[in-house]
């Protein structure tokens, strides 16, 4: 193991605690340790040990309480089906290795629901859904026996119940008891049996959480009836006067640690962003807790529905805020949520019964003080009149999601707190904060949002193209003349926006190479569309050798791009996508977007440059206020423009100007950056406002970017607001919703 055998801060020696085939890491300042095994293996007989007051580590005990001398990493197996009703499965085996498959078939007269074939996965779980053989005879459909569980009860009439159990040493997640309800659905959620080493993968969590959250947010019309036995989706009438409160509850206790706390904050920022992308504006409550809770945002505050403001409050919270009182009092934290939900003088306000409440609790597990938090969940249910009226149980008005992070999570506790709803998962156990961050990046990135413009995967594991998924590399091969390199931006599934000067009229489509997403292969080009007013020789007679007005072109691709995490479009001005990205009202006009993105001041922006085969973001300021004139006047220092009497001859209203040393020293563009996007980063989204066109000084003469550059080193970019009619005409079939 990588640890020295010196005593940790706790009082337990590390001698003899090693695990065969794996390693261990200390937790809670040496008061606990976690065994870590390679993928496909689990620590036997336990995953964690605690340092006892006697100065020895807790004993290595198997599930049937036998003592083991040394821990070891054993191959993960998937559980066998204890029972399978009304059918057969094959092959039969006492246990199954990773990547083993089983198949299910039903007896005559029974129909298979769920997955006919399932594969044993590396986390010890079976792929797919529970296989169920049903003949449709019950009022409710057969709820099935998830692999690894045992079911008691085989009558599926209205109000009949079934109960589930797990083998010794396994923890039941989900509902132990399910009842056949009016309408043909089962109460609660499907159970599963969890071993302590089992974690949900980020992908599983993202999918399950998102599909449940989407149900909550989007709702479906309650008029859609369904017959008995059909799977019932949650149905909520979205009353326009109804609303939604989301309570974010974050464990800030000792055991969490500062970097995990920061990670959890990132997750919640992504969650707020995700919810905003659905176009809903819930009110947020924000609570962190250790020994005591601290309310940072109350749902009653005026700004609690302003996602940007809530994000700002969240980002300003410090882990140190709970340093002096660092126990884990989950009950008190939930009481803080209860206090936000309840109303003064116990007089319910108008519309209280149309507000849906979502609690999202992130914790590393054990509440060690304050008593059982489940009692508060019961009080909240009472307050919201949930589960009291059989005809209208109002279960849809409360969702409690619990994210357990790390090895110390008590699965029984977190399962008790979480909501249990049919076909939904509300409790998640992830390996570590990195995995939880993955969840929220995946969640923001699920396929529905792939077409959202200006979205990036800002994850620590992200590649250059995860972080700049719109960036395109363009090269033009000219026989006997070498080749020209440019950049561009993906603006739709068929188009890349770039600079017109990257091409000459003689360039043939087959000599133009475009690549996106960091892929090696080049895309086939159908045509390059130049702005009709672009004419590099347009002012030769007036002694202006090169004239870059309207220096924009669109490359139309032969085949549709397949959007993914490393290929997606940037937002264009005056489109509906940008209205949504900036969270502006749907009635926003083009003029209003212009005022939002290009106000008359210095505007923080960025461009993407390639340095030593890596894409890097360079922060610049667009001089659009009092520095605009001096920025534009520096164009006279450009080669060939020294004799120009009136600088507006070359710097037309189509240009934006960056560079220089005020308000900050801006980095400059290089030749190969031409055609790339000039971007404004706002509300966690990226909107292209310009196309890089030309620069006053070549700061990259010898393949290296000069560090010291003169103050007059300015760069000029075509302002996309000034070529909108052309963009709109050429992209009119691309569904971008130009305003």
């Amino acid at each position: 193991t990588p640890w020295s055998l010196a005593r940790p801060q706790g009082s337990c020696s590390l001698e003899g605690v090693e695990i065969k085939g794996g390693s261990f890491r200390l937790l809670q300042e040496g008061q606990a340790l976690e065994y870590v095994c390679p993928s496909g293996f689990y620590p036997y007989p336990v995953q964690t040990r605690t340092c006892r007051s006697t100065g020895s580590w807790s004993t290595l005990k198997t599930q049937d309480q036998k003592t083991v001398r040394k821990a070891e990493c054993r191959a993960i197996h998937c559980p066998r089906p204890h029972d399978f009703e009304n059918g057969e499965y094959w092959p039969r085996s006492p246990y199954y290795n990773v990547s083993d498959e089983i198949s299910f078939h039903c007896y005559d007269g029974y129909t298979l629901r769920g997955s006919a074939n399932r594969t044993c996965q590396v986390n010890g779980r079976w792929s797919g859904q529970t296989a169920i053989c049903d003949n449709g005879a019950g009022y409710c459909s057969n709820p099935g026996i998830p692999i690894g569980t045992r079911k008691v009860g085989s009558q599926y009439r209205l109000e009949d119940s079934v109960t589930y159990h797990c083998s010794r040493g396994l923890t039941l997640r989900g509902s132990q008891r399910r009842t056949c309800q009016e309408g043909g659905s089962w109460s609660g959620t499907e159970p599963s049996c969890q071993d302590s080493f089992m974690y949900d993968t980020p992908q599983e969590v993202a999918e399950a959480f998102l599909s449940s959250l989407t149900e909550t947010i989007e709702g479906v019309d309650a008029e859609d009836g369904h017959g008995p036995g059909e799977q019932q989706k949650r149905k909520i009438v979205l009353d326009p006067s109804g609303s939604m409160n989301i309570y974010l509850v974050l464990d800030g206790s000792d055991s969490i640690g500062a970097s995990n706390f920061t990670g959890a904050k990132k997750c919640l920022v992504n969650l707020i962003e995700k919810v905003a992308s659905y176009g809903v504006k819930p009110r947020y409550g924000l609570v962190t807790y250790a020994t005591y809770p601290k309310i940072w945002v109350k749902v009653s505050e005026a700004d609690s529905s302003n996602a940007d403001w809530v994000t700002k409050q969240l980002n300003e919270i410090n882990y140190e805020d709970h340093k002096l009182k660092s126990g884990t009092n989950t009950k008190k934290a939930l009481q803080a949520v209860y206090s936000m939900m309840s109303w003064p003088d116990d007089v319910p306000p108008e519309g209280w019964n149309r507000t849906r409440h979502v609690i999202i609790l992130m914790t590393d597990g054990l509440h060690n003080m304050g008593g059982d938090p489940i009692t508060v969940i019961d009080e909240i249910r009472d307050l919201l009149y949930i589960g009291k009226d059989r005809k209208n149980p109002r279960e849809d008005y409360l969702d409690v999601y619990v994210f357990g992070v790390g090895p110390l999570v008590n699965q029984v506790n977190i399962n008790a707190l979480a909501s249990k709803k049919d076909n939904e998962q509300h409790v998640f156990k992830v390996k570590d904060m990195e995995n939880l961050e993955d969840v929220f990046y995946q969640m923001i990135d699920e396929s529905q949002s792939l077409s959202l413009c200006g979205m990036v995967w800002e994850h620590r594991k992200g590649t250059d193209y995860h972080k700049q998924p719109w960036q395109a590399k363009i090269s033009v091969i000219r026989p006997s003349k070498g080749h020209e390199s440019c950049m561009g931006a993906v603006v739709s599934e068929y188009f890349v926006l770039t600079a017109a000067h990257c091409f000459t009229v003689d360039d043939k489509e087959h000599s133009i190479k475009v690549s996106v997403g960091g892929e090696k292969r080049d895309l086939e080009i159908e045509v390059v569309l130049f702005h009709p007013n672009y004419n590099i020789n347009g002012k030769k007679e007036a002694g202006i050798p090169e004239f870059y007005d309207y220096d924009v072109a669109l490359i139309k691709l032969k085949n549709k791009l397949k959007y993914g995490q490393t290929i997606r479009p940037i937002c264009l001005p005056c489109t509906e996508g940008t209205t949504r990205a900036l969270r502006l009202p749907p009635t926003t006009t083009c003029q209003q977007q212009k005022e939002e993105l290009l106000p008359a001041q210095d505007i923080k922006a960025l461009f993407v440059s390639e340095e030593e085969k890596k894409l890097t973001r360079k922060e610049v300021y667009i001089k659009n206020g009092d520095k605009k004139g001096s920025c534009e006047r520096d164009a006279q220092y450009a080669p060939g423009y020294d004799k120009v009497k009136d600088i507006s001859e070359v710097v037309t209203p189509r240009f934006l100007c960056t560079g220089g040393v005020s308000p900050y020293a801006d980095p400059n563009t290089c030749r190969g950056d031409s055609g790339g996007p000039l971007i404004v980063h706002k509300r966690s989204r990226f909107i292209q406002v310009g196309v890089i066109s030309w620069g006053v000084v070549d700061v990259c003469k010898n393949q290296k970017r000069q560090k010291q550059v003169p103050a007059h080193a300015r760069d000029f970019h075509i302002n996309l607001f000034q070529v909108l009619p052309w963009l709109k005409e050429k992209l009119q079939d691309e569904d971008l919703g130009f305003l």
């Epitope: 009619p725 709109k728 305003l739």
Partner: antibody, heavy 121, light 92 residues
């Protein structure tokens, strides 16, 4: 307030070139998001958009027309021009000049009263 | 005093980018409704527009003598911008 006024020759012979002028006031064609367009209406028939010019000098034409007109502007004198070469009797119509704010959600806000053109030999 | 509805059908979806114009017998043209249902400034509230996809309509809820005119719809979704053939409204 915004006003637009069209002027033209009134009568032309086939194969001659039509030159129309739209003089406007109350706005500037260098203002972001503004454009001016030409629309015509043959007597007793419907309206047909011909061409538009925008604040940034972008020009757009009706691609369904047999002969493409030419639109241009003189921003400092608040004028927009339309030329159609080699007219024939099918070009007999009333020609309107309109102000167009940029954007799909906008209509032709302000119309001139129109100038009549007859093409006959 | 009557209520009248004039319909306009597009050959393909136009995303609500539809405008209505009124041309009086003397030839003057005015914008009434833009973006399917937004009332242009100065237009009486008895005029209203609705529709989506390919089918749109203009409704005059309480007909006045001065509403005698020809009404044109116009799509602003894709170039070339096109007008409908016009509907002439007369009062009995």
């Amino acid at each position: 307030q915004v006003t637009l006024k069209e002027s033209g020759p009134g009568i032309l012979q086939p194969s001659q070139t039509l030159s129309l002028t739209c003089s406007f006031s109350g706005f500037s064609l260098s203002t972001f998001g503004l454009g001016v367009g030409w629309i015509r209406q043959p007597s007793g028939k419907g309206l047909e958009w011909l061409a538009s010019i925008w604040w940034n000098d972008d020009k757009y034409y009706n691609s369904d027309l047999k002969r493409r007109p030419t639109i241009s502007r003189d921003t400092s004198n608040s004028q927009v021009f339309l030329k159609i070469s080699s007219v024939d009797t099918a070009d007999t119509a009333t020609y309107f000049c309109v102000q167009i704010p940029y954007g799909s959600r906008n209509g032709f806000d302000y119309w001139g009263q129109g100038t009549s053109l007859t093409v006959s030999s | 005093g009557d209520r009248v509805t004039i319909s306009c059908s597009a050959s393909q979806g136009i995303n609500n980018y539809l405008n209505w114009y009124q041309q009086k017998p003397d030839g003057t043209v005015k914008l009434l409704i833009y973006y399917t249902s937004s009332l242009h400034s100065g237009v009486p509230s008895r005029f209203s527009g609705s529709g989506s996809g390919t089918d749109y309509s203009l409704t005059i809820s309480n007909l006045e003598p001065e509403d005698v005119a020809t009404y044109y719809c116009q799509q602003h979704s894709k170039l070339p911008w096109t007008f409908g053939g016009g509907t002439k409204l007369e009062i009995k």
